[in-house]
Interface confidence: low
């Protein structure tokens, strides 16, 4: 499977909300021994590898803001620390996998990472993530709503395996 | 099978450091949470930090921050936890644990205990 | 932290014998609670996982339930190799936290 990062740049007004989005796309095994992990976090651009540094969002680390699931189960975050930082993170059975963030500030821009690690218990991992670009503007020159820019079709297919 | 086999028995001095080694076999390592909880004699258990070594960075009780360093070799399925500034009070078992799935920490696979002695 | 209290911190019972024993979380942690047996000189065994869930292989006799702040552990029909501590965990919120365990012992 691979994952694809829909729009690879969000820019924002300060104060806005925004849904920053991956999808996992092809085949998905939904056996009983296979698990899905999707988490996000921050990251910059690496020389070497983009998403390979691992930084918390809002203080929150990926523990935090992970989801676990078998195939293409919906599920969402309902911890309440992540409710408290403005952030929720949710699935559904499409294979889409969202991050939301509320109330923006200028601080909240970066590069964010979606991880996603399938798990054959007890066997094998095969891990791929998707990088994006928030952008969060204040003044004149910001827009009233969020804007994205989708990802160049070789951007969107961000693929590592383990 | 998953087995974590803990590294032997250690007497320490107060003010030093000890480092436990926590081997997994027979599963993947990178993806499941490694945790360190210990027991002192007669006493509960006391989880003090975990680490998924597909991440790396560890997470750790607020009682033991500053104290206590857990780190993952992938390479070598091996878990590490060090405690420094050791007193007395943390003569204990020190069990590694893994987690059931991925990265919750429900334990179903523990370590067979390394006892620690802090003495003058 | 999630404080959890467990009750009672010992009972004695007989081979046969339905037990019960309660964990209370400080605040509400849903159903992240884990149960767990230890014998003297050995490692934690889990029993239930997600307060209800029997992990793979413990007998049948074991259960739990709850949710929110309210938990129980049922030993339906206390065996002598039942006799140990038990103790209960949440795995909600970061630190982890154990109750301050149940020793079993016989009548």
């Known amino acids: 499977f691979k994952v694809a990062t829909p729009y690879s740049l969000y820019v924002c007004p300060e104060g806005q909300n925004v849904t920053l989005t991956c999808r996992l796309l092809g085949p998905v095994d939904k056996g009983h021994d296979v698990t899905f992990y999707k988490t996000w976090y921050r990251s910059s651009r690496g020389e070497v590898q983009t998403c390979s540094e691992r930084r918390p969002i809002r203080n929150l680390t990926f523990q935090d803001l992970h989801l676990h699931h078998g195939g293409h189960q919906a599920a969402n975050t309902s911890h309440d620390l992540a409710q408290r930082h403005g952030l929720e993170s949710a699935s559904d059975h499409h294979g889409n996998f969202s991050i939301t963030m509320r109330n923006l500030t200028l601080l909240d821009s970066g590069l964010y990472c979606c991880l996603v690690v399938e798990i054959r218990h007890h066997h094998s991992e095969h891990r791929v993530h998707g990088a994006m670009e928030l952008q969060v503007q204040t003044g004149k020159d910001a827009p009233s709503n969020c804007v994205v820019y989708p990802s160049s079709s070789q951007d969107s297919e961000n693929i590592t395996a383990a | 099978q998953v087995q974590l086999v803990q590294s032997g028995a250690e007497v320490k001095k107060p003010g030093s450091s000890v480092k436990v080694s926590c081997k997994a076999s027979g599963g993947t390592f990178s993806s499941y949470a490694i945790s360190w909880v210990r027991q002192a004699p007669g006493q509960g258990l006391e989880w003090m930090g975990g680490i998924i070594p597909i991440f790396g960075t560890a997470n750790y009780a607020q009682k033991f921050q500053g104290r206590v360093t857990i780190t993952a070799d992938e390479s070598t399925s091996t878990a590490y936890m060090e405690l420094s500034s050791l007193r007395s009070e943390d003569t204990a078992v020190y069990y590694c644990?893994?987690?059931?799935?991925?990265?919750?920490?429900?334990?179903?696979?523990w370590g067979q205990g390394t006892l620690v002695t802090v003495s003058s | 932290d999630i404080q959890m209290t467990q009750s009672p911190s010992s009972l004695s019972a007989s081979v046969g014998d339905r037990v019960t024993i309660t964990c209370r979380a400080s605040?509400?942690?849903?159903?992240?609670l884990n149960w767990y047996q230890q014998k003297p000189g050995k490692a934690p065994k889990l029993l239930i996982y997600?307060?209800?869930s029997l992990q793979s292989g413990v007998p049948s006799r074991f259960s739990g339930s709850g949710s929110g702040t309210d938990f129980t552990l049922t030993i339906s029909s206390l065996q002598p190799e039942d006799f140990a501590t038990y103790y209960c965990?949440?795995?909600?919120?970061?630190?982890?936290?154990f109750g301050q365990g149940t020793k079993v012992e016989i009548k």
């Open positions: 965990q949440q795995n909600r919120g970061s630190p982890i936290t």
């Open positions: 644990a893994r987690s059931s799935y991925g990265w919750s920490y429900e334990f179903d696979y």
């Open positions: 605040q509400s942690i849903n159903t992240d």
């Open positions: 997600a307060a209800s």
